[in-house]
């Protein structure tokens, strides 16, 4: 279970077509 203080920070993963981009790369989202 995530600690409360971590909830405002993004989690970053590799994906394609994410983060408003057409290619593959790292994408960080809260």
């Amino acid at each position: 279970r995530r600690r409360r203080r971590d909830t405002h920070f993004p989690i970053c993963i590799f994906c394609c077509g994410c983060c408003h981009r057409s290619k593959c790369g790292m994408c960080c989202k809260t």
């Epitope: 920070f9 993004p10 989690i11 590799f14 593959c24 790369g25 790292m26 960080c28 989202k29």
Partner: antibody, heavy 121, light 107 residues
Amino acid sequence: QVQLVESGGGVVQPGRSLRLSCAASGFTFSNYGMHWVRQAPGKGLEWVAVIWYVGSNKYYADSVKGRFTISRDNSKNTLYLQMNSLRAEDTAVYYCARAQEGMAPDAFDIWGQGTMVTVSS
Amino acid sequence: CYELTQPPSVSVSPGQTASITCSGDKMGERYASWYQQKPGQSPILVIYQDTKRPSGIPERFSGSNSGNTATLTISGTQAMDEADYYCQAWYSSTNVVFGGGTKLTVL
């Protein structure tokens, strides 16, 4: 100015441990992912590990997985690399590098000066 | 295991254009970054997201990426551009790949 300063390198015997540190200044450390990248003498760059904003969001290269641990202390603006079960092939200059800011941090935009780790008996 | 292949060396005359290639499986489907490293120094980011230049990097540095090849182009090459150049791309969350590096010699 924005700066990363590594420390903790040295000569260590195979199988032993070493902890590297990277002191950050000139930017809000907690707002950036941080990497370790190494370079064996006369060789190219090799990515080692990354730790993103949340301490649990971290990834390792297969070559170091299970032996190295990346961590950060945002209150001290410091990045760490705990290296256990060291091997001769771990001999390299170790750089800490900052991930780009933003939603899509593909590149390494700031690099430290590096610290040399030599694994030898 | 993914690999990015660069030519070991490229030579160029001052004022001419240097092109350094970086080839890998479906390279054009991911974002390429390029780094410059001079002897005894740390790497410097010169191109990211295929074509973008960080602030402070001269306009003579440009990049492209399509198919299986990313290319770093240095127009009007200067003596100060002599260095090793590395491409880099992500292939998964746990797989950041650097090319083997290209030594650029300005004749």
